[in-house]
């Protein structure tokens, strides 16, 4: 969490941002909140990015002001106009790309004063893994697949019965570049699995951590997946 305070002159106001991650090829949110003002027309929101000449987005007098917007953000940005009055200056970013990563500044002016806070925005790819029994294999084998990751993640297998066991000798992980030549498909195979046990395939990079669980019994197979973003630090 980054909390910024105002600049000299008028009173300072508190602006709060949360470091976040964007999944490339989807819309992303850059979070920013501030001490609200009672009059929308008195609020100015400016989003800036380190190393970018033009503005990322500007909202003033109750509407978007995009004449100074940098070309790389043209047609891609929006604030939640109906939530500005309650202190929400968060930015929606359409079709996040790797190049959108960097340091952003959320700069606010209200009748109470000015304030700003920086935000570290990471971009990458992350997806839910799916674990299945591989019936084509000669022995009992599990196959964990996740369609899109970037940067290249680590894959670790774990089991409920053999807690703390190292499965690196009985597993094999491969990374296959996807057609857009950025993200990769993750495939990990675990050999010699035993029945009546729960296995977890954990995929992690510096942006996200995802887990796919599978419980195999003689009568049924149960699956569960979970994904968590790692870098939600507020400032």
């Amino acid at each position: 969490l980054i909390i910024g305070f105002g600049i000299s002159g008028r009173h300072s106001i508190t602006v709060t941002t949360v470091a976040s991650a964007g999944n490339i090829g989807e819309d992303g949110i850059l979070s920013c909140t501030f001490e609200p003002d009672i009059k929308l027309s008195d609020i100015v929101i400016q989003w800036l990015k380190e190393g970018v000449l033009g503005l990322v987005h500007e909202f003033k007098e109750g509407k978007d002001e995009l004449s100074e917007q940098d070309e790389m953000f043209r047609g891609r940005t929006a604030v939640f106009a109906d939530q500005v009055i309650v202190g929400n200056a968060s930015l929606r970013l359409k079709n996040v790309q790797l190049t959108d990563a960097g340091t952003y500044k959320c700069y606010i002016i209200t009748s109470k004063g000015k304030g700003n806070a920086n935000l570290e925005y990471k971009t990458g790819a992350f997806s839910m893994p799916e674990v299945n029994v591989d019936y084509n294999a000669s022995s009992e084998t599990l196959r964990c697949e996740a369609p899109r990751w970037f940067p290249q993640p680590t894959v670790v297998w774990a089991s409920q019965v053999d807690q703390g066991a190292n499965f690196s000798e009985v597993s094999n992980t491969s990374f296959e570049l996807n057609s857009e030549n950025v993200t990769m498909k993750v495939v990990s195979v675990l050999y010699n699995v035993t029945i009546n046990n729960t296995y977890s395939c954990m995929i992690e990079n510096d942006i996200a951590k995802a887990t796919g669980d599978i419980k195999v019994t003689e009568s049924e197979i149960k699956r569960r997946s979970h994904l968590q973003l790692l870098n939600s630090k507020a400032s």
Partner: antibody
């Protein structure tokens, strides 16, 4: 040249299924938000479905649970699988690319007629 | 759901005249996510304006877009014979993800 070419339309009975294809050239489908938009005879434009660059999908309420959008990255082709077709699905179906600047590239359209 | 209402439904003008088409949203729309399209009979729509006011590639400068919040306008400064068509505004970003106005038909007087 950046181009989209649809195919697969035709006459189908209510309750039937049809798969539309949209072949892209001059750009990579998986790097863009790819959409299906339809236009009933004499009517306006109606958005049907999107597949994001990430592969996630979204649908208009009118087709949710009946239509499935997908893509084949190796063929650079977009698809729309339409099941449980109804008379009100009769329309010209366009595929369209959203390259952040709005729907900037459209196919020529393929006609779907649902009638008994 | 954001509803886009275009007016007038039909606009009858002569070549050389100025055309002003309106698009009103039921709630605030980001200027970045507002676009205008032109469609001629038997053809696919063509992107004219994106980001409320930026002309798409190859679009003549007689076409201009303006507005913000809930009120947007497409202006054609001097009508050419090839401009007579149906015009749609469109927004991105809420559910449904893309919404079109019902269209304005621009016809020759």
């Amino acid at each position: 040249e950046v181009q989209l070419v649809e195919s697969g339309g035709g006459l189908i009975q209510p309750g039937g299924s049809l798969r539309l294809s949209c072949a892209a050239s001059g750009f990579i489908v998986s790097r863009n938000y790819m959409n299906w938009v339809r236009q009933a005879p004499g009517k306006g434009l109606e958005w049907v479905s999107v597949i994001y660059g990430s592969g996630r999908t979204d649908y208009a309420d009118s087709v949710k649970g009946r239509f499935t959008i997908s893509r084949d990255n190796s063929k650079n082709t977009l698809y729309l699988q339409m099941n449980s077709l109804r008379a009100e699905d009769t329309a010209v179906y366009y595929c369209a690319r959203d390259a952040d600047y709005g729907l900037d590239v459209w196919g020529q359209g393929t006609t779907v007629t649902v009638s008994s | 759901e954001i509803v886009l209402t275009q007016s007038p439904g039909t606009l009858s003008l002569s070549p050389g005249e100025r055309a002003t088409l309106s698009c009103r949203a039921s709630q605030s729309v980001s200027s970045s996510y507002l676009a205008w399209y032109q469609q001629k009979p038997g053809q696919a729509p063509r992107l004219l304006i994106y980001g409320a006011s930026s002309r798409a590639t190859g679009i003549p400068d007689r076409f201009s877009g303006s507005g913000s919040g809930t009120d947007f306008t497409l202006t054609i400064s001097r009508l050419e014979p090839e401009d007579f068509a149906v015009y749609y505004c469109q927004q991105y970003g809420s559910s449904p993800l893309y919404t079109f106005g019902q269209g304005t038909k621009l016809e020759i007087k």
